[in-house]
């Protein structure tokens, strides 16, 4: 389904008859169809999007979303304000930075518009949720005859990410990986000349700031070996594709959160 | 392969009531609303109401309320509708149709079973 | 309850003629919700186009669907033997699930 972004006074209800949902065991009373689950991810504390499968209601329904954080300054209910669609029916809510607290409580309320009593509630940590960008920048040194280091940057989280290197030359089979902790820089000791060498890079939001799951995309691949420049054959480096947005289309020269702020967050 | 079986013809009294099968296979039974549709000989298709097979829970068309009920059995992935009440205006092919896992259409079908109501 | 009418009731053409089937709703119905059926005797329905436009799996090309609001049309480019059947539409926006009377194409 092909998800586009409006906001509410784009969103065409589509109304439909009030009918009678029942569960088979007992056909007098009316019993309701659960909502489908709402997932969140953050997006490198730029953006938040909270998705649910609009297809699994029984009708195409403009679902509701509200959203608020528990115990905290932020706790007045919010409705959303930039809806996602699928369909041309509600499918999502994307949050801007402004309205990101990592280290609260966040609560979503999904609810029918047509049926109040029908609605569901979720509390999620988003520390937990938070998906950062693809690494980029990726850079080779050659620090001795047979040593390489890889170098690459993460935009804005750097400190908070662990990351995973997987490497292989063209006559491995599969990938040999190795986790790598904040530091954003993996050597490889002993490098076969004859060989063409493949390198790729993802990260996540864990464990300095948060406990997430996901992992980025990976990185673009960077190569080196017998294939590459031969004009300096100690430096190659390959800038990763920018497929995400710029930090100047969100509109924001200030970062997101310092690195103090993260710390003070994560042990506070 | 992913299809529909359902039950063989039935011929009913009118005041009888009938109950029809539809066996899914090939595909997660539970993940997909069941619809049931009906078309009388020579006539147009007409819808009946839905079962939801993860919960259980139904939603009848107003005109067949109070004489339809739709279950299912998800250890034997099938779907039942059963009408009460037969009237001769009931005779037709009940269909059983599986609405799409990504929209609201219905995207396969069953071969139908006929009901034939006689006195 | 959204009301769809078919037109014409029958169409009487030869191989290889186009085919133009009407639909035509009570009320506006998003073009994401319209879906044609083709039935032959004695088979069920198979779904051919939905969202008003989209073929379903296996549909040949010939088939395609236009149409929003309230003016839906299905258009068969060139007949095949094989295409001689009863056409419904059916709006999926809104319960309760409506189809159209049918049309008929039917060889000349």
């Known amino acids: 389904l092909n998800t586009t972004i409006l906001t509410p006074n784009g969103n065409e209800d589509t109304t439909a008859d009030f009918f009678l949902t029942t569960m088979p065991t007992d056909s007098l009373s009316v019993s309701t169809l659960p909502l489908p689950e709402v997932q969140c991810f953050v997006f490198n504390v730029e953006y938040m999007n909270c998705t649910w499968n609009s297809s699994s209601e029984p009708q195409p329904t403009n679902l509701t979303l509200h959203y608020w954080y528990k115990n905290s300054d932020n706790d007045k209910v919010q409705k959303c304000s930039h809806y996602l669609f699928s369909e041309e029916i509600t499918s999502g809510c994307q949050l801007q930075k402004k309205e990101i607290h990592l280290y609260q409580t966040f609560v979503v309320q999904l609810q029918d518009p047509r049926e109040p009593r029908r609605q569901a509630t979720q509390m999620l940590k988003l520390q937990n949720l938070v998906i950062p960008w693809a690494p980029e920048n990726l850079t080779l040194h050659k620090l001795s005859e047979s040593q390489l280091e890889l170098n690459w940057n993460n935009r804005f989280l750097n400190h908070c990410l662990e990351h995973l290197v997987q490497y292989r030359t063209d006559w491995d089979h599969s990938w040999t990986e190795q986790s790598v902790d904040y530091r954003h820089k993996f050597s490889l000791p002993s490098v076969d000349g004859q060989k063409r060498y493949t390198f790729r890079v993802r990260s996540r939001f864990n464990p300095l700031c948060g406990s997430a799951q996901h992992w980025s995309e990976w990185s673009h691949p960077i190569h080196w070996g017998s294939n590459t420049s031969k004009e300096n054959p100690f430096l190659f480096a390959l800038e990763a594709e920018q497929k995400l947005i710029s930090e100047e289309d969100l509109g924001g020269e200030q970062k997101l959160i310092s690195e103090e702020d993260l710390h003070h967050h994560h042990h506070h | 392969q992913v299809q529909l079986v359902q039950s063989g013809a039935e011929v009913k009294k009118p005041g009888a009531s009938v109950k029809v099968s539809c066996k899914a296979s090939?595909?997660?039974?539970?993940?997909?609303?069941m619809h049931w549709v009906r078309q009388a000989p020579g006539q147009g298709l007409e819808w009946m109401g839905w079962?939801?097979?993860?919960?259980?829970?139904?939603n009848y068309a107003k005109r067949f309320q109070g004489r339809v009920t739709m279950t299912r059995d998800t250890s034997i992935t099938t779907a039942y509708m059963e009408l009460i009440r037969l009237r001769s205006d009931d005779t037709a092919v009940y269909y059983c149709?599986?609405?799409?896992?990504?929209?609201?259409?219905?995207?396969?079908w069953g071969r139908g079973t006929l009901v034939t109501v006689s006195s | 309850e959204i009301v769809l009418t078919q037109s014409p009731g029958t169409l009487s053409l030869s191989p290889g003629e186009r085919a133009t089937l009407s639909c035509r709703a009570s009320q506006s119905v998003s073009s994401s919700y319209l879906a044609w059926y083709q039935q032959k005797p004695g088979q069920a329905p198979r779904l051919l186009i939905y969202?008003?436009?989209s073929r379903a799996t296996g549909i040949p090309d010939r088939f395609s669907g236009s149409g929003s609001g309230t003016d839906f049309t299905l258009t068969i480019s060139r007949l095949e033997p094989e295409d001689f059947a009863v056409y419904y539409c059916q709006q999926y926006g809104s319960s309760p699930w409506t189809f159209g009377q049918g049309t008929k194409v039917e060889i000349k």
């Open positions: 149709a599986r609405r799409s896992g990504r929209s609201w259409y219905f995207d396969l």
């Open positions: 079962i939801y097979p993860h919960s259980g829970h139904t």
């Open positions: 090939g595909y997660t039974f539970t993940g997909h609303y």
């Open positions: 969202g008003a436009s």
